[in-house]
């Protein structure tokens, strides 16, 4: 039975040209994390392995950087950075958890760097 | 140089039993999960079945599942596949890989060839 | 299970001809798609991981596209070497899948 419940920072919005972190949080849980894939809409953007530690995908390695912990962090911001982001737990014994977090990127005099919207 | 290296196929009557192996070499062996992938001749690639990094998860496609079991030796950097209740259609080569973070097969064994027949 | 529908089957091309083959997805496989390159007698050996990655050592004249349902594996300019059947296979869920093959044959 899957009792763990993913912690995300939900909805964020950012500055263009700057950069935000995106994490996620696995709890209630005794389960094992093996791996955590983070995904860009339809697209792989990173991985972290247990075993193997970080895979960034080619496509992303110059404005993608693994961490703070299993987070990840985006640099360079653009517009078209807008959209959902899901952080993918691949866990042992439970099974797959996944959290899912907005990003809207804004242009600088828009924005608050960071803040948080609230979630409906 | 990362290598895979199978072994233990060969021709076996249908209902018998064979065992391959996998030698791995190269590479940290324990930190990767492993696939065993087949096929008939003249045919595609078909999964068989895989393993995590610790051997503590498996996963086994429909067509094999009840009669195979893959297992692994870290300490022997080893893979194993024990097949069972052998039918025709499982005549195929039987290729093991390595499978980083669980989503490419980056590298691939020659292959062992089975032949189940009477 | 996630079907993997590939064409076409086979084709016949030329040396420098652009080739692109085609695999789609019976449902959405986010980038979690993969290309192999098998010669007679030999091993698959990977092209392309997670849609668009091309693997180390793999010529750039391979490159791949696509996310959610429909790929693509292009050659921009055939060479002889590459004359070979080419393989799509998702790892988005057990069990993995592949597609049926494309031989690119010489015209």
């Known amino acids: 039975m899957m009792t763990g419940t993913i912690e995300t920072t939900g909805n964020i919005s950012a500055e263009k040209g700057g950069s935000i972190i995106l994490q996620c949080h696995l709890s209630s849980t005794t389960a094992q994390v093996t791996q955590v894939n983070w995904e860009q809409q339809d697209q792989l953007l990173a991985i972290c392995n247990a075993d193997l530690g970080w895979h960034i995908s080619p496509s992303f390695k110059d404005r993608v950087a693994p961490g703070p912990g299993l987070g990840l962090t985006l640099q360079s911001l653009t517009v078209n950075d807008t959209g959902e982001y899901f952080c993918i737990y691949h866990t042992y014994p439970d099974g797959t958890y996944t959290g899912r977090i907005f990003l809207e990127v804004l242009e600088s005099s828009v924005a608050e760097h960071g803040a948080r919207f609230q979630i409906p | 140089e990362v290598q895979l290296l199978e072994s233990g196929g060969g021709l076996v009557q249908p209902g018998g039993s064979l065992r391959l192996s996998c030698a791995a070499s190269?590479?940290?062996?324990?930190?990767?999960?492993m696939h065993w992938v087949r096929q008939a001749p003249g045919k595609g690639l078909e999964w068989v079945a895989n393993?995590?990094?610790?051997?503590?998860?498996?996963g086994y496609a429909d067509s094999v599942k009840g009669r195979f079991t893959i297992s692994r030796d870290n300490s022997k950097n080893t893979l194993y596949l024990q097949m069972n209740s052998l039918r025709a259609e499982d005549t195929a080569v039987y290729y093991c890989?390595?499978?980083?973070?669980?989503?490419?097969?980056?590298?691939w064994g020659q292959g062992t060839l089975v032949t189940v027949s009477s | 299970d996630i079907q993997m529908t590939q064409s076409p089957s086979s084709l016949s091309a030329s040396v420098g001809d652009r080739v692109t083959i085609t695999c789609r997805a019976s449902?959405?496989?986010?980038?979690?798609l993969n290309w192999y390159q098998q010669k007679p007698g030999k091993a698959p050996k990977l092209l392309i991981y997670?849609?668009?990655s091309l693997q180390s050592g793999v010529p750039s004249r391979f490159s791949g596209s696509g996310s959610g349902t429909d790929f693509t594996l292009t050659i921009s300019s055939l060479q002889p070497e590459d004359f070979a059947t080419y393989y799509c296979?998702?790892?988005?869920?057990?069990?993995?899948?592949f597609g049926g093959g494309t031989k690119v044959e010489i015209k």
């Open positions: 890989a390595r499978v980083p973070y669980d989503v490419w097969m980056d590298y």
């Open positions: 190269g590479f940290t062996f324990s930190s990767y999960s």
């Open positions: 393993i995590n990094s610790n051997g503590g998860n498996t």
């Open positions: 449902q959405s496989i986010s980038s979690y």
């Open positions: 997670a849609a668009s």
């Open positions: 296979q998702q790892s988005y869920s057990t069990p993995l899948t």
